[in-house]
Amino acid sequence: MGCDRNCGLIAGAVIGAVLAVFGGILMPVGDMLIEKTIKREVVLEEGTTAFKNWVKTGTTVYRQFWIFDVQNPDDVAKNSSKIKVKQRGPYTYRVRYLAKENITQDPEDHTVSFVQPNGAIFEPSLSVGTEDDNFTVLNLAVAAAPHIYQNSFVQVVLNSLIKKSKSSMFQTRSLKELLWGYKDPFLSLVPYPISTTVGVFYPYNDTVDGVYKVFNGKDNISKVAIIESYKGKRNLSYWPSYCDMINGTDAASFPPFVEKSRTLRFFSSDICRSIYAVFGSEIDLKGIPVYRFVLPANAFASPLQNPDNHCFCTEKVISNNCTSYGVLDIGKCKEGKPVYISLPHFLHASPDVSEPIEGLHPNEDEHRTYLDVEPITGFTLQFAKRLQVNILVKPARKIEALKNLKRPYIVPILWLNETGTIGDEKAEMFKTQVTGKIKLLGMVEMALLGIGVVMFVAFMISYCACKSKNGK
């Protein structure tokens, strides 16, 4: 009878030990299985979860615009006063709804190439007005012409055309015209076949971004989605030195197993450069734990504050010998037009940049850019890309419309907020397929280990107690 009990207790302890050992073994084995599955599923090739979402994003992406309506155009043109602006918006468009095209796998170098078609659909229900709303903004062609032709002879010619077309420093344009293009009356007088259509994003609809060539991750998962080349080149040819490099991914995803200590590098064709984000906080997105990576102020700093940025300072006059910060001259990427990119409302920009403009209210929460990355898969499940488009206008003695200016202005035209969040259905699916499975496996591991240890300890104590009792 005593033997039966003892044998039972030992058997229970052995089962507990086996469960505990199995739970313990399951931890690295399970992690290995998860890693293997993740590695298999994030590869960019036909049949994987990642590929399906990569070809056509399952997220609805909106681009909201706020236009800076100039309140005192005549005063600025006549007296070189501060420019008073009032932002109007949001005007919302649905973007990135088109699938990637010309997808070509290269098994030799483990890359996949594609183009991303551009398209924008106006969303009246998410906008404060219509595409026909009018705004007083800088005359893009008048401001750009003397910058492109810094030649006094040609400026005299251009002045004749500007006067003839009754153009001036500022103009009134509809939202649709300003964003997507209008026939400029001044440029229309140039007697040579030049493009006379002007718009902040012209041309956009029916154009493509790319060709992008990215690593598919088949041979090395730590390179998945990293851009190998853009438009057939590994460099941009816009910046000197390492600033010209195409680094990282396109920000839609990153190689899996993202750590908080990691700097996420990505390339954005909108700003004609590679940039980076650093870990900000852990957040819960529809029940999925994600890491929020934010663009640090350091990325927009002057070379004095961040020496790494020295090669993004390509001109010395407007930048006050590279001491100004928070604006990026992307003219080389825009056919020489004086386009400057910044954060909205000149967030993180030096006071000299925003001083000539009245009506700006920078706000970290509203105007910063962030990426919410699910750390196991590296997928960006939510993002907010915020940037401002500005045009430099300088005094030009030979152009009457600009001759009264006493200083250069970096004039804000508009700012945009491009956002995307994983849908509820997709989030549930993601939880079921990824985080749910990982959680379940973790729970099974802990349960086995816990139950096993408790059983082993309990049965061993009982066995020992029985033995001592019998010994007496």
Epitope: N151, F153, V154, V156, V157, N159, S160, P191
Partner: antibody, heavy 117, light 107 residues
């Protein structure tokens, strides 16, 4: 086809006046602006005057300022160079030329102006 | 005014020779330089604008280079019809100014 044809040259006494014409075809002179360039016998080219597009400003070489006047009649698509107080050193072949960005892509055949007593 | 100094003022060359004419501006004119060819009794003809841009219909043996203050016109292989006088011109600032010319003669 773009063509420029000068006329009005000839022999004139010092202190005299002459009006040169430049008839254009194949393009609108007001869109481009017209220049006059001269070449003294055996010498190089010298820019003389310019009328900017759309009847814009007029510009002159220092050597002719106050004596020469450039004008255009858009209805006739013709440019003119009114030359007063002519001097011996104004003797030259006068060309009219089309330009927009400052280089001359089309030239007339030239008309000879001789200032001599 | 911007002075344009051409050199040499004349040169003798044979058919097939490579000929180089230089032009120096008295101040920076960026790439706003044009080159012309003129034959006796004729109007000048545009060869090159913006220092390097070959005008339509001009043979590819003509090429231009330079930026700032120093510019060059090169004829890679001289042809019989190339014997003429060549002028450079800056189209950066008014008054527009020409070089004094380079006469290319048969050796």
């Amino acid at each position: 086809e773009v063509q420029l044809v000068e006329s009005g040259g000839g022999l004139v006494q010092p202190g005299g006046s002459l009006r040169l014409s430049c008839a254009a075809s194949g393009f609108t002179i007001s869109s481009f602006g017209i220049h006059w360039v001269r070449q003294a016998p055996g010498k190089g080219l010298e820019w003389v005057a310019w009328i900017a597009p759309y009847g814009g400003e007029t510009y002159y070489a220092d050597s002719v300022k106050g004596r020469f006047t450039i004008s255009a009649d858009t209805s006739k698509n013709t440019a003119y160079l009114q030359m007063n107080s002519l001097r011996a050193e104004d003797t030259a072949v006068y060309y009219c030329a089309r330009s927009f960005f400052g280089y001359f892509d089309y030239w007339g055949q030239g008309t000879l102006v001789t200032v001599s007593s | 005014d911007i002075q344009m100094t051409q050199s040499p003022s004349s040169l003798s060359a044979s058919v097939g020779d490579r000929v180089t004419i230089t032009c120096r501006a008295s101040q920076d004119v960026s790439n706003w330089v044009a080159w012309y060819q003129q034959k006796p009794g004729k109007a000048p003809k545009l060869l090159i604008s913006y220092a390097t841009s070959l005008y339509s219909g001009v043979p590819s043996r003509f090429s231009g280079s330079g930026s700032g203050t120093d510019f060059t016109l090169t004829i890679s292989s001289l042809q019989p019809e190339d014997f003429a006088t060549y002028y450079c011109q800056q189209h950066s600032n008014a008054p527009l100014t020409f070089g004094q010319g380079t006469k290319v003669e048969i050796k």
